[in-house]
Interface confidence: low
């Protein structure tokens, strides 16, 4: 229709979009309206992603890893948006997009850079090794490699061990820290700097308590506010370690304001859970409740660990009796 | 409706080369991916040879890789098979066919064929 | 390359019979499987494609199964103008390799 020293040539424009695996997105593309419109979008500049023209989407030649995936904006065509819809992104897709629209006026390129990133929830571990205590910061699948920073007292600490473990699509990180005899606090930050999404882990050990067998033992358990948003779904666990492996007495969650207790002589006390407190009562304690105690608040954000130690000592009367 | 018709076949010596054609007619043409496919005949069908809808991207079976060529010309509504190097194994009907509008490279028209006879 | 294997290579069965045709790839294809009819002296015919999508015109008697490696084409109740040789085809990337074909004739 138009000779071609008419048609406009605009130089490449660059746009980063970010996607999270297994969500959809949208990488944008808008050009000046006009009649007889041809979008192409390929990947890497050969595979063809998705190709619209003469009114209609035309996939033959789509690459099979796209089939299903793709669709425009139909609607918004006429108005100069091609950008395309993407569904269920992976790591794969990772790359440079071009979108090539024609018009009887002009052919515009856009890129587009995909980066995808992943973080499923990390969590903090506290786990008894023989005689060696170990917080474990360990997060199941991320992309790209984490940053990873431990405090004690909330002082940087530099030995930092990773254990790595990269699969075709993401990492699986542990990072381990012996707190063996240590009454300190310590924190671990897991960031994902494409995402721009921060996971906090915090353990807190309390002072020892000393019980007699028959009395009931108060231990406390309060978020530190930094961290604590309640209007987030979290989380909280109470367990008691035995023999090396911790056994739930008892969990609540927010979502649904839920309580399940396991052990008959824990109680929680309603209204401080209202007030974000989830100190725990054992009641008619015995020898064998000695041991560490473990209250876990999780959220997508956060995990904040306290453990307490109880011993449970022999009463006087048991004691003469023996 | 959607017409294909392959020429060019004939009997050839072994390492002489031949072009075949296909004119399509009844769809646009534009749009599709076409194929080679040929067939000995009273044997299986073998797979040849693809060619994107704009020509950009091509694909051919290793049995031939090397020794023919898929081209098409979008404005004469005309696919070909350029065969150089022929071999005895070459001998078939060889069909010209036409992606289905939804698919990813499989066919819903096929030509009539156009035997290939190499022989000394 | 991917090896597309069928069996059985030939049957005969009865008019009225449920027939039923198997197609193995070497390895996963997930559903990008086609089947083809070819009967004697005539070009191909597309049946089936996406591993159970039905062509439109071919008759409900036909359908197609499977995902992966193992895919089956089944007659339901096979009919006199049946008789053909069929063939599957993976597409799911080049080479777009066609099965061996399996013949099927009337009892």
């Known amino acids: 229709i138009f000779p071609l020293a008419f048609f406009i040539y605009v130089p490449m424009n660059e746009q980063i979009v970010i996607g999270r695996l297994d969500e959809d997105i949208i990488l944008p593309s808008s050009f000046e309206r006009g009649s007889e419109v041809v979008i192409h979008w390929k990947y890497q500049d050969s595979y063809k992603v998705h190709s619209y023209y003469k009114g209609s989407d035309h996939l033959e030649s789509q690459d099979p890893r796209y089939a299903n995936r793709t669709s425009l904006f139909y609607n918004e065509i006429q108005n100069g948006n091609a950008s395309l819809f993407f569904r269920r992104v992976s790591l794969l897709d990772e790359g440079i997009y071009t979108c090539y629209v024609g018009t009887a006026i002009q052919v515009i390129t856009n890129k587009v850079v995909l980066k995808v990133g992943v973080f499923l929830t990390p969590v903090m571990k506290y786990e008894k090794r023989n005689t060696n205590s170990f917080l474990i910061c360990s997060v199941l699948s991320v992309y790209p490699r984490p940053i990873i920073t431990w405090k004690m007292d909330n002082t940087p600490i530099s030995e930092n061990n990773m254990e790595e473990t990269g699969s075709l699509d993401s990492f699986s990180i542990n990072s381990p820290l012996n707190i063996t005899g240590s009454n300190s606090s310590y924190e671990c930050t897991i960031e994902n700097s494409l995402l721009k999404q921060t996971w906090t882990g915090r353990w807190t050990m309390k002072d020892g308590l000393h019980k007699m067998q028959s009395e009931h033992v108060s231990l406390s358990c309060q978020p530190v506010n930094d961290y604590f948003s309640p209007n987030q779904d979290f989380k909280v666990t109470w367990s008691r370690m035995k023999s090396g492996t911790f056994s739930v007495l008892a969990y609540y969650l927010s979502s649904s304001q839920n309580t399940i207790i396991n052990e008959s002589r824990f109680s929680w006390n309603k209204e401080l859970i209202n007030q974000s407190d989830f100190s725990m009562n054992l009641m008619d304690l015995n020898l064998s409740d000695s041991g560490e105690y473990l209250c876990n608040i999780s959220s997508d954000e956060y995990t904040l660990l306290t453990i307490h130690t109880v011993h449970v000592e022999p009463s006087q009367e048991t004691a003469s009796h023996n | 409706q959607v017409q294909l018709v392959e020429s060019g076949g004939g009997v050839v010596q072994p390492g002489r080369s031949l072009r075949l054609s296909c004119a399509a007619s009844?769809?646009?043409?534009?749009?599709?991916?076409m194929h080679w496919v040929r067939q000995v005949p009273g044997k299986g069908l073998e797979w040849v040879a693809v060619?994107?809808?704009?020509?950009?991207?091509?694909d051919y079976a290793d049995s031939v890789k090397g020794r023919f060529t898929i081209s098409r010309d979008n404005s004469k509504n005309t696919l070909y098979l350029q065969m150089n190097s022929l071999r005895v194994e070459d001998t078939a009907v060889y069909y010209c066919?036409?992606?289905?509008?939804?698919?990813?490279?499989?066919?819903?028209?096929w030509g009539q064929g156009t035997l290939v006879t190499v022989s000394s | 390359d991917i090896q597309m294997t069928q069996s059985p290579s030939s049957l005969s069965a009865s008019v009225g019979d449920r027939v039923t045709i198997t197609c193995r790839a070497s390895q996963g294809i997930s559903n990008y499987l086609a089947w083809y009819q070819q009967k004697p002296g005539k070009v191909p015919k597309l049946l089936i494609y996406?591993?159970?999508t039905l062509q439109s015109g071919v008759p409900s008697r036909f359908s197609g199964s499977g995902s992966g490696t193992d895919f089956t084409l089944t007659i339901s109740s096979l009919q006199p103008e049946d008789v053909a040789t069929y063939y599957c085809q993976k597409y799911n990337s080049a080479p777009f390799t066609f099965g061996p074909g399996t013949k099927v004739d009337i009892k």
């Open positions: 996406a591993a159970s």
């Open positions: 066919a036409k992606d289905l509008i939804s698919g990813i490279y499989y066919v819903d028209h």
């Open positions: 009844g769809f646009t043409f534009s749009n599709y991916g």
């Open positions: 060619i994107w809808y704009d020509g950009s991207e091509k």
